[in-house]
Interface confidence: low
């Protein structure tokens, strides 16, 4: 840019003119330096002096300017006869994250100095949270009433939600920023005409056992009176680690009769007190007709009559399944709702959220807990997350 000024009138960059000395003169010189993580590439020393032709000259390299190159501490590979070195990098993800890309994560430097992948061009991969791979999975040999202490952190997707009246319930982490819970949990101590906007600020949510996370919004299922489900969006993504990890959403329905799932929870224990420690229980999926008869007397709509042994009727429909008490009289209880019925797919070595506990009033009195089928709500979950 031609400033219209003589070059020797150095730009006013806030640098005071040095004082003159007798029988001497001031020589203008500059030193080139590089930003963090870059280093100077030059055969000179980076110091350039203004000559009488108003050119910046370095003693060793003349008017050839230095360059800043990435200082990654990576030595230059040796050259080979009749060959050349091709620069390539492989993207990898930190622990508990995996690469999401249609390519292989390897990028090569092209002639235009762009990093290019054969399959996806210059589109970079992303690191997404691993789901359903706890570092210390629950041991099926051990035997949330009764139940076992989750001493090893086997249920890193389990969150604890506390209402503004200090009632504890469950929620289930399904990705870095979203959790599933029940609509009933969200409405605890709220009137039926409360809105999602009213509800969000009244909830406190903990992940990783005791780490508080802030809620941005809640989204209720459009048919929440029949499908007892809501989603919670966090203000920030959580860092996934061995204590905090989402559970995977299933691509198939694991809720077949007899299949055993694990349900963890912060709900009431055998003394009917809220537990200070996360507990878990192993429960089998029950026959749906038996469950309906247990709670409603009949599977025939016109013959149904409220029969719940605990005085509260669960929602039972095509979006739900039941799980029975264990043979040890272990069961879910108040405060466990919102927790996942987690099934371990042994072939994939992955844990899937097959259901979300909706009816947690069984407490070893009624025979069945009732769960919302995750396969029934999966389209809505994915659509909601995409839109928000």
């Amino acid at each position: 840019v031609d400033s219209g000024n003589d070059v020797t009138d150095i730009a006013d960059d806030g640098c005071p003119k040095p004082p003159e000395i007798a029988h001497g003169y001031v020589e203008h010189s500059v030193r080139y330096q590089c930003k963090n993580y870059y280093k100077l590439r030059t055969e000179g020393d980076g110091v350039y002096t203004l000559n009488d032709k108003k050119q910046w000259i370095n003693k060793a390299v003349g008017d050839k300017l230095p360059e800043c190159e990435a200082d990654d501490g990576c030595p230059k590979p040796p050259e080979i006869a009749h060959g050349y070195v091709e620069h390539s990098v492989r993207y990898q993800c930190k622990n508990y994250y995996k690469l999401r890309t249609e390519g292989d994560g390897v990028y090569t430097l092209n002639n235009e100095k762009q990093w290019i992948n054969k399959a996806v061009g210059d589109k970079l991969p992303e690191c997404e949270a691993v789901c359903g791979k706890p570092k210390n999975p629950a041991n099926p040999v051990q035997r949330i009433l009764g139940g076992h202490l989750d001493a090893k952190g086997s249920f890193p997707w389990q969150a604890k939600m506390v209402s503004h009246h200090n009632l504890t319930t469950g929620a289930t982490l399904i990705n870095e920023q979203w959790l599933l819970t029940t609509a009933k949990n969200l409405f605890l101590n709220h009137s039926e005409n409360a809105t999602a906007k009213d509800i969000a600020p009244t909830l406190t949510l903990y992940v990783g056992k005791k780490q508080l996370v802030e809620i941005e919004k809640v989204v209720l299922h459009p048919n929440y009176s029949q499908v007892d489900i809501g989603l919670i969006k966090l203000k920030q993504k959580v860092s996934v680690n061995e204590r905090v990890m989402p559970i995977c959403l299933p691509s198939k329905d694991y809720a077949e009769v007899g299949r055993v799932g694990y349900v963890s929870g912060w709900g009431r224990n055998a003394n009917f007190k809220f537990t200070d420690h996360l507990k878990y229980v192993m429960l089998p999926v029950a026959d749906q007709d038996q469950c309906i008869r247990h709670y409603e007397g009949s599977t025939v709509p016109e013959k149904k009559t409220p029969k719940s042994p605990v005085g509260v009727q669960p929602i039972l429909n095509e979006h739900t399944f039941c799980a029975g008490m264990s043979k040890y009289q272990e069961d879910t209880c108040y405060g466990d709702a919102g927790s996942a019925f987690a099934v371990h797919d042994l072939e994939e070595d992955t844990w899937y959220a097959t259901g979300i506990l909706s009816f947690d009033k069984s407490c070893a009195v009624a025979e069945y807990g009732v769960y919302v089928k995750v396969t029934s709500i999966q389209d809505w979950v994915q659509k909601t997350i995409a839109e928000n």
């Epitope: 600020p201 005791k210 780490q211 508080l212 996370v213 802030e214 203000k235 920030q236 959580v238 204590r243």
Partner: antibody
């Protein structure tokens, strides 16, 4: 560059009030929980108060509860600490701090240089 | 409230030494522990979070370990820049944030 700059410290008499400010820059202020921490002469670090990105979440140490109030103005990227009924034992360097990562309550990775409060008659 | 007890209060060591500072919590805090370094007249600097995770740009000679109630900070080979005061901090949200009383690491 992430930067926090405290101001508002000074000399105040016992029973007096001061309001500290912390100007934040270089990050999304309204998505981060913020805290005040102090260090009294010859003593260790002491947590004072924290406020979430969502201001429903406020926590204050028992030693200052009822006297100190934390607040924030997200439109001005500024954190405040209103200090009333000051005592000699409140004399300290006061730091504001930003949480490290995405958790609302986390270790603090960015600190201001501090502002000094002296309570003396 | 939770109490954090750091030891020793003062530690004399030489450049190149391996030093260990310990921190004990009065109740389990899982992995929610941080270590900070503070030099006179300066703000504290985060070294370790989640008990053992190294904060970015902190030299790898610093390491942390432990969970529950017992934690340690280790400096594998002391450098002149490492002489400072070190604090542990519990930041589990169920308690007030509690600091240890500090360990002054000085030149022998």
């Amino acid at each position: 560059e992430v930067h926090l700059l405290e101001s508002g410290g000074g000399l105040v008499q016992p029973g007096g009030s001061l309001r500290l400010s912390c100007q934040a820059s270089g990050f999304t202020f309204n998505s981060n929980a913020m805290s005040w921490v102090r260090r009294a002469p010859g003593k260790g670090l002491e947590w004072i108060s924290s406020i979430g990105a969502n201001t429903n979440y406020i926590y204050t140490a028992d030693s200052v509860k009822g006297r100190f109030t934390i607040s924030r103005d997200n439109s001005k990227n500024t954190l405040y600490l209103q200090m009333n009924s000051l005592r000699a034992e409140d004399t300290a360097a006061y730091y504001c701090a930003k949480n490290r990562d995405r958790y609302s309550y986390d270790a603090w990775s960015v600190w201001g240089q501090g502002t000094t409060v002296t309570v003396s008659s | 409230d939770i109490q954090m007890t750091q030891s020793p209060s003062t530690l004399s060591a030489s450049v190149g030494d391996r030093v260990t500072i310990t921190c004990r919590a009065s109740q389990s805090i899982d992995i929610w522990l941080a270590w900070y370094q503070q030099k006179p007249g300066k703000a504290p600097k985060l070294l370790i979070y989640e008990a053992s995770s190294l904060e970015s740009e902190v030299p790898s000679r610093f390491s942390g370990s432990g969970s529950g109630t017992e934690f340690t900070l280790t400096i594998s080979s002391l450098q002149p820049d490492d002489f400072a005061t070190y604090y542990c901090q519990a930041y589990n949200s169920n308690y007030p944030y509690a600091f240890g009383q500090g360990t002054n690491l000085e030149i022998k």
